[in-house]
Amino acid sequence: KELKVTQPEKSVSVAAGDSTVLNCTLTSLLPVGPIRWYRGVGPSRLLIYSFAGEYVPRIRNVSDTTKRNNMDFSIRISNVTPADAGIYYCVKFQKGSSEPDTEIQSGGGTEVYVLAK
């Protein structure tokens, strides 16, 4: 099946201190390689979360990503602050061994607006 990365929401609004879910689904797990969430684009983009075993405070996967056929790579960000505002991208990589992983497709992005409480 052809790989497609889908972020259904173009934007989400969340009150400071609350949590929000950023949705991302894939149509294929091939080629093998990690899925990562970034805020922003280009060389200065910020890695927010990687589905590769690393622990990140305030961020959790929504589904059981240890299922071998899991294609839901949505994340929940808790205790949102104004600094979390921005556009978030779900990005699928093809594994690299001697070389870095290769980005092969990105979702369309979801903008997070943080509202004052």
């Epitope: 091939l30 059981d64 299922k67 056929n69």
Partner: antibody
């Protein structure tokens, strides 16, 4: 420190059943997929079955499908392998193993020996 | 099926390479597992093609390209004598497989 302790092995007759256990400690058990791997005497490693962190999804090699059942109890930090209709070919050391994010293995149990003999 | 040499030998201090072929780079991740004696617990020396667990010495390294993976031991030591199994996870079939094992003898 991550620790996996296998138990439940022993000597059984062909056709009988056995339930293996693996007690996990030193990590958040409910966050990791787990697998069972065996090694017959003088042979290599053979992956048998895997289970997702939540326990809802299971995976088996064809040769044990329908005879073996992998399960887990996250409240007890324990992994299980129910083995039915055992044959002499099932004689092996059985290891539990913790899976990495991409379903390889990073930690292994010490193993428990299962002998099927009449 | 994964194919690896039955045995390799080296003198202390030499570099050893053990290859494992038969996987598809597009759908496969490789790992390497050390077993010092039959029936003893395997130890993971490499997972995810090239990731070394924190407690494994830096002389162990891994790589993968095309349909093969390679375990390299740079400056092999007597205590590295063991059987090394390559393993693979296939994201197409959701199945794990292992090679038959390579016996490393340090002369």
């Amino acid at each position: 420190d991550v620790q996996l302790v296998d138990s439940g092995g022993g000597v059984v007759r062909p056709g009988e059943s056995l339930r293996l256990s693996c007690a996990a400690s030193g990590f958040t058990f409910s966050s990791y997929a787990m697998s069972w791997v065996r090694q017959a005497p003088g042979k290599g490693l053979e992956w048998l079955a895997g289970i997702s962190a939540g326990g809802s999804d299971t995976y088996y090699i064809d040769s044990v499908k329908g005879r073996f059942t992998i399960s887990r109890d996250n409240s007890k930090n324990s992994l299980y392998l129910q083995m039915n209709s055992l044959t002499a070919e099932d004689t092996a050391v059985y290891y539990c193993a913790r899976e990495t994010w991409n379903h390889l293995f990073d930690y292994w149990g010490l193993g428990t020996l299962v002998t099927v003999s009449s | 099926a994964l194919t690896q040499p039955a045995s390799v030998s080296a003198n202390p201090g030499e570099t050893v390479k053990i290859t494992c072929s038969g996987g598809d780079y597009y759908s496969t991740y490789y790992g390497w597992y050390q077993q010092k004696s039959p029936g003893s617990a395997p130890v993971t020396v490499i997972h995810s093609d090239d990731k070394r667990p924190s407690d494994i010495p830096s002389r162990f390294s891994g790589s993968a390209s095309g349909s093969a993976a390679t375990l390299t031991i740079t400056g092999v030591r007597v205590e590295d004598e063991a059987v090394y199994f390559c393993g693979a996870y296939d994201g197409r079939t959701y199945i794990n497989t292992f090679g038959a094992g390579t016996t490393l003898t340090v002369l």
